[in-house]
Interface confidence: medium
């Protein structure tokens, strides 16, 4: 079985999660991509997706989520701004490739959002203190409704990778237990 790994991001309310999902350039550059939340024992729920076909470097905003697909680099950039405690949960990027099932991109992202002052700008390497101005050209894309039953969460054995400064605020771990996540607003 494929080893499902995850990266853990611990952020404060009001901060921004800013991550990338990399994909095979030749196969998936223009494919529609999505950001999903995974709830315990349920099929992943799509929260935002790029247009179809996906446009290069064209921001798509759905609520507090911004997706940008960099075709030249094989990267999907995902930002979740103004984080709330309820955003805590397990997330993943997928590539839609109908009629086949969505292709999951590793790693999954374990987001833990806690209450409290977010600190001075730059104090957390994984956050931005709400400085992002949402580009005026953002568009909202319609996402396919189907999800893959194969991506229902299962927990592989625990294993922890080392992290050293300046990455000390990020803990890379394998999936252990999947917490129940409140509905994403």
């Amino acid at each position: 079985a494929t080893k499902l790994t995850e990266e853990k991001y611990e952020l404060k309310e009001g901060q921004t999660l800013d991550v990338k999902c990399d994909y095979t350039l030749e196969k998936f550059a223009s494919s529609q991509k999505a950001w999903q939340i995974i709830r315990d024992g349920e099929m992943p729920k799509t929260l935002a997706c790029t247009e179809r076909p996906s446009k290069n470097s064209h921001p798509v905003q759905v609520g507090r989520i911004i997706l940008e697909d960099y075709h030249d680099h094989g990267l999907l950039r995902v930002r979740m701004v103004n984080l709330q405690v309820e955003d805590s949960g397990l997330y993943q990027c997928v590539i839609y490739q109908p009629p086949k099932e969505p292709h999951m991109l590793f790693d999954r992202i374990r987001l833990v959002v806690t209450k409290g002052f977010s600190g001075t700008p730059g104090s957390n390497e994984n956050s931005t203190q709400n400085v992002y101005k949402i580009p005026p050209t953002t568009t909202k894309a319609l996402c396919p409704l189907y999800t893959s039953p194969r991506t229902v969460t299962q927990a592989p054995p625990k294993s922890t990778a080392d992290v050293s400064t300046p990455d000390s605020e990020i803990n890379l771990t394998n999936v252990t237990d999947i917490i129940r996540v409140p509905v994403f607003n």
């Epitope: 990266e7 921004t16 800013d18 991550v19 990338k20 999902c21 990399d22 994909y23 095979t24 960099y70 030249d72 680099h73 094989g74 990267l75 950039r77 995902v78 930002r79 590793f106 790693d107 992202i109 001075t120 700008p121 730059g122 104090s123 957390n124 390497e125 994984n126 956050s127 931005t128 203190q129 400085v131 992002y132 101005k133 990778a161 080392d162 992290v163 050293s164 300046p166 990455d167 990020i170 890379l172």
Partner: antibody, heavy 122, light 108 residues
């Protein structure tokens, strides 16, 4: 101690290829990306691209697309950078550097290899 | 691509003095994705500051970073003899990652 050790200096003729190696130690190789940065004599730093040691995905600077190939050998924790069709303006010190963990957007580099001098001359 | 312009090109100071180095971006850069490096002759660069203001491991507290948006500053509160080197800023918010042209801090 996290360390990157690069291969030795190379002298090449225009049109040839060069392959520089970068052996990592002191950390879990597959948890981080390896970036390549070059510095022409007396000049500043130029980011060339990076490879994810986790899944082998590569991202290259636009100006080097088609001439550069970055690879890794996870069994030996070694990254490689091959540059083809060498020109005189490729003469530079080539550095490998460790990036941040695989999913973080944005990258800065720590630590760096000691550098490999590549001289392209006829 | 984001262009980073560093000034001054050369800074001539004496040990014990305060050094203020500037890095200006052609467009807004989140402070979370701005770094500073030090490079001495014949050596590889060394990470000093990441996230605009966080010191990397082992970097003395005389080095500090600040700024947001398009203007960032590296300050060395009291120059030590080993601080005379070239300093580069780097942005990591927009591909391709780019470096500034560098500021050389030399002994006056």
């Amino acid at each position: 101690q996290v360390q990157l050790v690069q291969s030795g200096a190379e002298v090449k003729k225009p049109g040839a290829s060069v392959k520089v190696s970068c052996k990592a130690s002191g950390y879990t190789f597959t948890s981080y990306g390896i970036h390549w940065v070059r510095q022409a004599p007396g000049q500043g730093l130029e980011w060339m691209g990076w490879i994810s040691a986790y899944n082998g995905n590569t991202n290259y600077a636009q100006k080097l697309q088609g001439r550069v190939t970055m690879t890794t050998d996870t069994s030996t924790s070694t990254a490689y950078m091959e540059l083809r069709s060498l020109r005189s303006d490729d003469t530079a010190v080539y550095y490998c550097a460790r990036g941040r963990p695989s999913s973080s957007w944005g990258n800065w580099f720590d630590p760096w290899g000691q550098g490999t001098t590549v001289t392209v001359s006829s | 691509e984001i262009v980073l312009t560093q000034s001054p090109g050369t800074l001539s100071l004496s040990p014990g003095e305060r050094a203020t180095l500037s890095c200006r971006a052609s467009q807004s850069v989140s402070s979370s994705f701005l770094a500073w490096y030090q490079q001495k002759p014949g050596q590889a660069p060394r990470l000093l500051i990441y996230g605009a203001s966080s010191r990397a491991t082992g970097i003395p507290d005389r080095f500090s970073g600040s700024g947001s948006g398009t203007d960032f500053t590296l300050t060395i509160s009291r120059l030590e003899p080993e601080d005379f080197a070239v300093y580069y800023c780097q942005q990591a918010v927009s591909l391709p990652w780019t470096f500034g042209g560098g500021t050389k801090v030399e002994i006056k």
